[in-house]
């Protein structure tokens, strides 16, 4: 609701500064708050623009202040007027000069329709001249000189709507600079009535509150509080729920406050007079001090809150036995809440007696817009109203305000909110790397649309064309794993950024897709690598029998061991060999096979193999001749690789014999390294020599080796081990 | 929590009296109008009655006029409603309601009221 | 006084859709000094008194659910429940407090279809 409060401080002017303040209490208008001339109300008055500044001490507030020099301009009506959502709230009041021939009684008068009213001036200069009244500027009324009484009283017996206005008294010789004012307020209705046909009964309106004629509501006077002004504010305080503050050195003295129509213009409670700087009389308080206290039990009477009852009494005149009313407060509510964009469900909590209920607890949008709470709890000392906004958005920040209103009084608390942008990735993750099973994920957070900083980023995934809901992976790095893939499946990947607090999950980014490999087949089986020339090996397989219709082939992965050299032969898959060519001769190649379909398949172990040899074989080396007996001995050796020794021959003949009567072991393993010579003759000389062959030939050896056994009776000598053929 | 408690429902002949009353919790009963609204078994809504805050003000439906009576006893926190010269048309659950402007905001439980011979 | 004519007399809507319960007063319940509509809506379930939803109209009253709304001006309103839920089984009336006496709608049963 729009709380306007129009604050006249001083309406009688003299020679000192005068001011008129209004002022938005607890809510945000629209459009600024206008101070102006009321040229309805007083159309012959002056002409001069206002000077409008902002009210420092307040949020929203206008001022407007004369300097004691410009007095002589300021007599006349005035208007602030405050606009929300359409609706529009218009203040009236008056300054006029303090050495005026006649004062007012009251700044303004509400009566119900069909009063008995009198509107009263106090004859304050006597001068031998007729006076003469005006409404709204217009001659009415005038009283020869002779018979100008010390109150001036213009008399309306029925008061209608009609009468209503500014009613102005001077002497005829005189002008608006020496006139007096005072506002009639007649409310459209007859007492304790209200509504468009003035048909319905009002609330009672306690404290000199009025009961507005439109909507039957009270309107409170300065210094009470709450749906019928029964609650006495703090001490200075005034407004719709008591939080603007009075900061004069004696609190509300010298404030002349006006309401919207049909409340008009009032001290604050405690004060009287037309300058509001006459405290009230013992037993009186309220605006104008013109309650009167009735305390039962002698109780004591504040002039600002009138009877204050002993504990367990309550009522105006604590008539009313029970627990104390308690002005509600708002309890644990921040005065800054960061929420990001999307549902909030904000909470009011207050305390009071009695309890606020659930409609007496509403939450106003900085546009204005009154929420209902959706939920309501209470405990023995809070209520607590949790309201529901389905998507808040960026625009709805600012100062929203919980108000509570109670029988016990009304408390409004303005506190600010920020709403934030969710974050959003502005690219798509970036798919590095994939297998069947698997995916290496850039996942491309940034840059991003939307409010920081991110808490915690994931990645979400999922089969696409599958009814399965989004999986995903809490993410630390930007380079992630997936793993446990289905193979051969297509996928969806988008990434979701965290912001801090509730709700903080992003929409997801753009998304990517990409398809896992399929599973692959097993490699050939029993693979064997033989060379076939100088430049060439021959890798054989067993025939390969896939389970599915797939078209299959064979890869052929060959490097040399020595160069970096390295190619990649496709087989197809009916074939079981493959001939390996342009090779160098006396080479070591390292060779892996796969069976692949659209998915690659798993590669084989390496299996080795040399190229035939273009030269002759070295000799074998480490020739040594071991465990003589007097039959026997052991021959040991070593080769070289990568001559392509196909075998080893040890040839041997008693020492003096003729070249043609040797012996010649063939040796076809050429891993094996050591061989026994047996049925030798005992205590003889033999000649020994060992060759190597190859595809070329077989080595030249450089010198041969004697063996000599030993007689019959002799123990063998041990003399080093190795592979030997028996 | 604000409640209106009713009570003094029953059956009754026709042209005999009845009286029902209202008690008002958690609030201050003295400073609001109170209404008596009816339905008669099956039908719709029909408003009776209404007394200002202080009792000074009483409307009635013509339907009940000068044979019901609005009344308040503000020091008990009580609403009643004095049926008298009831006719079977009166049959219906009765309901005691504040207002919230021109609406009606809180409503008591309801009492039925049978004229039946 | 002033009749209150609501359509339909019975609605049955399935649940997840929109219910619409139209108001029709003798004359017009809108006071141009404040530009407000001085009408009401009611729910009431069986065995329990009237709930107040409405006041001025379109005002929703503290604690009821936001998929209910009230639009309207003059002499033409229209009670909105934009998604139906299975608690919203009831009978809805519209009043006007326009003038005394005040007077109500004779109701629209919702159910569910």
């Known amino acids: 609701a729009m709380d306007l409060i129009l604050i006249n401080s001083l309406p009688l002017v003299s020679d000192a500064e005068t001011s008129l303040t209004c002022i938005a209490s607890g809510w945000r208008p629209h459009e600024p708050i206008t101070i102006g001339r009321d040229f309805e109300a007083l159309m012959n008055q002056h002409q001069d623009p206002l000077e409008v500044t902002q009210d420092v001490t307040r949020e929203w507030a206008k001022k407007v202040v004369w300097k004691r020099e410009k007095a002589s301009k300021i007599n006349g009506a005035y208007f602030c007027e405050g606009r929300v959502r359409g609706e529009a709230i218009r203040i009236r009041t008056m300054k006029m000069r303090q050495q005026a021939s006649f004062l007012p009684a009251t700044l303004t008068m509400t009566v119900d329709k069909g009063d008995n009213v009198n509107i009263s001036f106090k004859k304050v200069l006597i001068k031998e001249e007729d006076a003469v009244i005006y409404k709204n500027g217009s001659f009415i009324h005038s009283v020869p000189r002779h018979e100008v009484p010390d109150i001036l009283e213009v008399h309306l017996p029925h008061a209608q709507p009609q009468d209503a206005g500014v009613y102005s008294a001077r002497y005829i010789g005189g002008n608006l600079f020496t006139s007096a004012f005072t506002r009639l307020i007649v409310r459209r209705c007859e007492a304790q009535k209200w509504g468009p046909e003035c048909n319905h009964l009002c609330t009672a309106c306690m404290n000199n509150g009025v009961c507005h004629e439109d909507t039957g509501e009270c309107i409170c006077p300065p210094g009470f509080m709450g749906r019928t002004c029964e609650k006495a504010c703090e001490l200075h305080t005034f407004g719709r729920t008591c939080k603007e503050r009075c900061s004069g050195q004696e609190g509300c003295k010298s404030y002349v406050f006006c309401l919207p129509d049909p409340y008009g213009c009032s001290c604050a409670t405690g004060w009287k007079g037309l300058q509001c700087n006459e405290a009230c009389h013992p037993g009186f308080y309220g605006p104008d001090c013109k309650l009167r206290c009735s305390c039962n039990n002698g109780e004591m009477c504040d002039r600002f809150q009138g009877c204050l009852c002993s504990p367990g009494w309550q009522g105006l005149q604590c008539e009313r036995e029970g627990i104390p009313r308690m002005t509600p407060k708002i309890v644990d509510l921040p005065d800054h809440i960061e929420v990001n964009s999307g549902k909030f469900n904000p909470i009011c909590k207050a305390s009071g007696w009695p309890l606020p209920t659930n409609e007496e607890m509403t939450l106003v949008k900085p546009d204005g817009t009154v929420l209902h709470p959706k939920d309501f709890n209470h405990t023995d000392h809070f209520s607590v109203a949790i309201f529901t906004i389905h998507r808040i958005l960026p625009p709805d920040s600012g100062v929203w305000v919980c108000s509570v209103n109670t029988v016990a009084g009304m408390v409004e608390k303005p506190f600010n909110i920020s709403v934030k942008v969710l974050p959003k990735p502005l690219n798509a993750p970036n798919v590095i790397d994939t297998g069947h099973n698997f995916a290496v994920i850039n996942i491309s957070s940034e840059p991003y649309f939307g409010d920081g900083p991110i808490k915690s980023k994931k990645l979400l995934y999922k089969p696409v064309n599958h009814y399965e809901a989004w999986q995903h992976i809490q993410v630390t790095n930007e380079i992630v794993t997936l793993n446990y893939l289905e193979p051969r499946t297509e996928y969806e990947l988008c990434v979701q950024l965290v912001r801090r607090g509730e709700g903080g999950e992003g929409h997801p980014g753009p998304v990517r897709r990409f398809t896992t490999a399929s599973i692959g087949l097993p490699p050939p089986r029993g693979l064997n690598l033989l060379p076939k020339s100088q430049t060439t090996l021959n890798l054989t397989w067993q025939p390969i029998f896939p389970s599915s219709e797939d078209d299959f082939y064979v890869e052929v992965e060959r490097r040399s061991v020595q160069k970096s050299d390295q190619q990649n032969i496709k087989v197809p898959g009916n074939l079981t060999s493959v001939l390996l060519n342009n090779l160098h001769p006396r080479e070591q190649y390292v060779v892996r096979a796969r069976v692949n379909t659209k998915a690659q398949g798993e590669w084989s172990e390496d299996l080795t193999a040399w190229t035939l040899s273009d030269i002759l074989p070295p000799q074998p080396e480490n020739i040594k001749i071991s465990n003589i007996t007097h039959s026997s001995a052991v021959i040991s050796w070593t080769i070289l690789d990568g001559y392509s020794i196909s075998s080893i021959t040890i040839r041997y003949k008693v020492q003096g014999k003729n070249e043609d009567q040797h012996v010649d072991v063939k040796i076809k393993n050429a891993t094996i390294t050591q061989y026994q010579l047996k049925g030798l003759e005992p205590e003889t000389a033999y000649q020994v020599d060992i060759f190597a062959e190859n595809n070329i030939g077989s080595s030249n050896p450089a010198f041969s080796h004697e063996l000599v056994t030993l007689p019959e009776s002799q123990a063998p000598a041990d003399l080093g081990g190795g592979k030997m053929l028996l | 929590q604000v409640q209106l408690v009713q009570s003094g429902g029953g059956v009754v002949q026709p042209g005999r009296s009845l009286r029902l009353s209202c008690a008002a919790s958690a609030l201050t009963f003295s400073n609001y109008a109170m209404h008596w609204v009816r339905q008669a078994p099956g039908k719709g809504l029909e408003w009776v009655a209404v007394i200002s805050y202080d009792g000074e003000n009483k409307y009635y439906a013509d339907s009940v006029k000068g044979r019901f009576t609005i009344s308040r006893d503000n020091s008990k926190n009580m609403l009643q409603l004095q049926m008298n010269r009831l006719r079977s048309e009166d049959t219906a659950v009765y309901y005691c309601a504040t207002p919230k402007g021109g609406a009606l905001e809180i409503w008591g439980q309801g009492t039925v009221i049978t004229v039946s011979s | 006084d002033i009749q209150m004519t609501q359509s339909p007399d019975s609605l049955a809507v399935s649940l997840g859709e929109r219910a619409t319960i139209n108001c029709k007063s003798s004359?017009?319940?809108?006071?141009?000094?404040?530009?407000?509509?001085?009408l009401a809506w009611y729910q009431q379930k069986p065995g329990q008194p009237p709930n107040l939803l409405m006041y001025w109209a379109s005002t929703r009253e503290s604690g009821v659910p936001d998929r209910f709304s009230g639009s309207g001006s003059g002499t033409d309103f229209t009670l909105t429940i934009s998604s139906l839920q299975a608690e919203d089984v009831a009978v809805y009336y519209c009043?006007?407090?326009?003038?005394?006496?005040?007077?109500f709608g004779q109701g629209t049963r919702l159910e569910i279809k």
């Open positions: 004359q017009s319940v809108l006071y141009s000094s404040n530009n407000k509509n001085y």
């Open positions: 009043q006007q407090y326009y003038s005394a006496p005040i007077t």
